[in-house]
């Protein structure tokens, strides 16, 4: 088992909104749960967009999930990852980081 590296990034979307993307990379096996949570509750599927789980050419896999949130509410959102029985949560970085 190779645990994923998880990285959360933010980018400007429409006025007052930002897109937050949670990327999981270099993991094996390919089965993974990756989802955005607001106040520890998973967002509905229709408010999230997932990337395909694809091989990265090094024998491991990668995927991502993105959602659009209101600027200023970042602290309410976390990316939840579960892989091979282990799980972790990852906050949205502050604007400067």
């Amino acid at each position: 088992t190779v645990p994923p590296m998880v990285n959360v990034t933010r980018s400007n979307a429409s006025e007052g909104n930002i897109t937050v993307t949670c990327r999981a990379s270099s993991f094996y096996p390919r089965n993974i749960i990756l989802t955005w949570r607001q106040d520890n509750v998973s967002l509905s599927n229709d408010t999230q967009q997932w990337g395909d789980v694809l091989p990265d050419g090094n024998g491991t896999y990668q995927t991502w999930v993105a959602t659009r949130i209101c600027r200023g509410e970042e602290q309410n959102f976390t990316c939840y990852m579960e892989h091979s029985g282990n799980h972790s949560t990852h906050p949205v970085p502050s604007n400067g980081s």
Epitope: T21, R23, S25, S26, R30, Q49, G51, D52, V53, L54, P55, D56, G57, N58, Q62, W64, A66
Partner: antibody, heavy 122, light 112 residues
């Protein structure tokens, strides 16, 4: 959408090697799978291999495993394919194409270069 | 390797006609991630191919809605509802689910 600028036509002798380049701009290079494809005149396309620019990991069509070697230079945002031990069978147009992994399209060849013509002749 | 067989080889059409191209794969082309990477490309003379359809039925950005893709399992179809002059060229189906990825032999759409 960005640009994928391929190097110019090559005339090479049998047995020699050639290194083709695909210089990119206008998108995040490391987020892309770059594929190389071969097309002989009047024929269909063949996929050679892909390389993921974020890690340099790759996947090859076994047919081209001993013929082609893919590399990337992230500092210059350029993908390369070296073709070795060239024969007349390697004469073709070679395309680079990309899949933007963090874009909305789940297509492997969403954007293409214009192709490089390689002619192998004594 | 997955063999992609396109029919017909040549498709003479009149402008405004509907055109239909078939693509049959030698085995099911569902990726291990459960997606079906069946794509359609159009190549005009002297140009690079251009993506039309991905994942069986999704139109790529900027592709007119007269193009549609359908199918499942091993049988896939590209339809052009009303052929325009700019649609002439060679159409290729492609599977990117199983390595090595493979293309069909092409269908040339030309004026009748």
């Amino acid at each position: 959408q960005g640009q994928m600028q391929q190097s110019g036509a090559e005339l090479v002798k049998p047995g020699a090697s050639v290194k083709l380049s695909c210089k990119t701009s206008g998108f995040t290079f490391s987020d892309n799978y770059i594929s190389w494809l071969k097309q002989k005149p009047g024929q269909s396309l063949e996929w050679i291999a892909w390389i993921y620019a974020g890690t340099g990991g790759s996947s090859y069509n076994q047919k081209f495993r001993d013929k082609a070697q893919l590399t990337v230079d992230t500092s210059s945002r350029t993908a390369y394919m070296q073709l070795s031990s060239l024969t007349t069978e390697d004469s073709a147009i070679y395309y680079c194409a990309r899949h933007d992994y963090y874009g909305t399209s789940g297509a492997w060849f969403a954007y293409w270069g214009r192709g490089t013509l390689v002619t192998v002749s004594a | 390797d997955v063999l992609m067989t396109q029919t017909p080889l040549s498709l003479p059409v009149s402008l405004g006609d509907q055109a239909s191209i078939s693509c049959r794969s030698s085995q099911h082309i569902v990726h291990s991630n459960e997606n079906t990477y069946l794509e359609w490309y159009l190549q005009k003379p002297g140009q690079s191919p251009k993506l039309l359809i991905y994942k069986v039925s999704n139109r790529f950005s900027g592709v007119p809605d007269r193009f549609s893709g359908s199918g499942s399992g091993t049988d896939f179809t590209l339809k052009i509802s009303r052929v325009e002059a700019e649609d002439l060229g060679v159409y290729y189906c492609f599977q990117g689910s199983h390595v090595p990825w493979t293309f069909g032999g092409g269908t040339k759409v030309e004026i009748k």
